[in-house]
């Protein structure tokens, strides 16, 4: 499989936002790339978000997605928002070179994202 | 060396409090035990806190210590408070069986404590 690198650990901010870079070693000159973020917890894998982009263009996630991102060459800067403590888990970056053929696939080792719920602020009375 | 077990990762609460258990395999029936918490960051090791206790009694840290703890058999429940994001690091549990002889020493593999600073609460005006 294609090599995909991502950080081992990231801490979400107290606002529940986590950002990390997913970098892939492209064998060739792909023009269409698909990036998917998967969450693995208790051996269950679920899709968090996905975006297909043309090289040189912006990543476009669905409007209701919790992810945003930008791309630069073979690097994708991913941001996941709205995270709560229960969302702590291993977030895996999957990269697919969709066009031109052939198809190449790479899976990162995952980024362990830790999320701590903030203490509620005291009532202002 | 004596075997010492501690968790690999702990998240500090949003209030900057982290707790973990340090468990040691005692070769004999020690009556006096010393527990030290060391912090390793950038290959520098510093002492965070230390307490000597008699088996069956409470751990007593110094009054100005950021640590508190309780013991139960060969387990020590450690709590570190007042942590900030800059305190993120590897916290190593060191256990010494001081009395009766012979002296035994054990060092854990360390607990990576992650600390996220909370967002300030909005002014109540």
């Amino acid at each position: 499989a294609m090599h995909v690198a991502q950080p081992a650990v990231v801490l979400a901010s107290s606002r529940g936002i986590a950002s990390f870079v997913c970098e892939y070693a492209s064998p060739g000159k792909a023009t269409e790339v698909r990036v998917t973020v998967l969450r693995q917890a208790d051996s269950q894998v679920t899709e968090v978000c996905a975006a297909t982009y043309m090289m040189g263009n912006e990543l476009t996630f669905l409007d209701d997605s919790i992810c945003t991102g930008t791309s630069s060459g073979n690097q994708v800067n991913l941001t996941i928002q709205g995270l709560r403590a229960m969302d702590t888990g291993l977030y895996i970056c999957k990269v697919e070179l969709m066009y031109p053929p052939p198809y190449y696939l790479g899976i990162g080792n995952g980024t362990q994202i830790y999320v701590i719920d903030p203490e509620p602020c005291p009532d202002s009375d | 060396a004596m075997h010492v077990a501690q968790p690999a990762v702990v998240l500090a609460s949003s209030r900057g409090i982290a707790s973990f258990v340090c468990e040691y395999a005692s070769p004999g029936k020690a009556t006096e035990v010393r527990v030290t918490v060391l912090r390793q960051a950038d290959s520098q090791v510093t002492e965070v806190c230390a307490a000597t206790y008699m088996m069956g009694n409470e751990l007593t840290f110094l009054d100005d210590s950021i640590c508190t703890g309780t013991s139960s058999g060969n387990q020590v429940n450690l709590t570190i408070q007042g942590l900030r994001a800059m305190d993120t690091g590897l916290y190593i549990c060191k256990v010494e069986l001081m009395y009766p002889p012979p002296y035994y020493l054990g060092i854990g593999n360390g607990t990576q404590i992650y600390v996220i600073d909370p967002e300030p609460c909005p002014d109540s005006d």
Epitope: P27, G28, K29, K94, M98, Y103, I107 | -
Partner: antibody, heavy 115, light 107 residues
């Protein structure tokens, strides 16, 4: 038009050697990982070997059935990939295909190992 | 190595039938699965890549689905020209093995 043309097949005795060649055209050869796949008579497709490209330091991978006997290589200046087959066995008989990461395939070349 | 279990090994169906072939892997391959069609005397032809994507020039009668360890190739309305052997392949592994094949015939 993409083309992959295998050559070098034929009849060889057990224990013998043979070198297969695959000439590619119509696509950027150096951008691709190249593979050899075979089909033995009455059997299914069997992946044999893969050679990656320059960004992957020309890493090679082999199936357990051919490791130590077969060697895959490539020459990007000639748009060609090769399979050197040594210590051939009767069970190596089949049609050998070269493929550019399974998107493009050659027409195959028949290798018969028999005494 | 990842094991590929393809079923059935053969099947016979009528023209117009909906046909499904399944492939199960011994571990999660994250959608890294291709499907091929091989007709006698011809080279294998890529039908589906990445579990769900239709290869260029392939009829929309063919579709792929699945994730994790379970994958399916579906032919929505079987045609006489679909008589062939179909193979799944794991493309995630460094050793991209094939399934054992499914021989499809017309009743």
């Amino acid at each position: 038009e993409v083309q992959l043309v295998e050559s070098g097949g034929g009849l060889v005795q057990p224990g013998g050697s043979m070198r297969l060649s695959c000439a590619a055209s119509g696509f950027t050869f150096s951008d691709n990982w190249m593979n050899w796949v075979r089909q033995a008579p009455g059997k299914g497709l069997e992946w044999l070997a893969q050679i990656r490209n320059k960004p992957y330091n020309y890493e090679t991978y082999y199936s357990a059935s051919v490791k130590g006997r077969f060697t895959i290589s490539r020459d990007d200046s000639k748009n060609s990939v090769y399979l050197q087959m040594n210590s051939l066995k009767t069970e190596d008989t089949g049609v050998y295909y070269c493929t550019a990461q399974f998107a493009y395939w050659g027409q195959g070349t028949l290798v018969t190992v028999s005494s | 190595d990842i094991q590929m279990t393809q079923s059935p090994s053969s099947l016979s169906a009528s023209v117009g039938d909906r046909v499904t072939i399944t492939c199960r892997t011994s571990e999660n391959i994250y959608g890294g699965l291709n499907w091929y069609q091989r007709k006698p005397g011809k080279s294998p032809k890529l039908l589906i890549y990445g579990a769900t994507n239709l290869a260029s020039g392939v009829s929309s009668r063919f579709s792929g689905s699945g994730s994790g360890t379970d994958y399916t190739l579906t032919i929505s309305s079987l045609q006489p020209e679909d008589v062939a052997t179909y193979y799944c392949q794991n493309v995630l592994s460094s050793r991209p093995g094939f399934g054992s094949g499914t021989k499809l015939e017309i009743k």
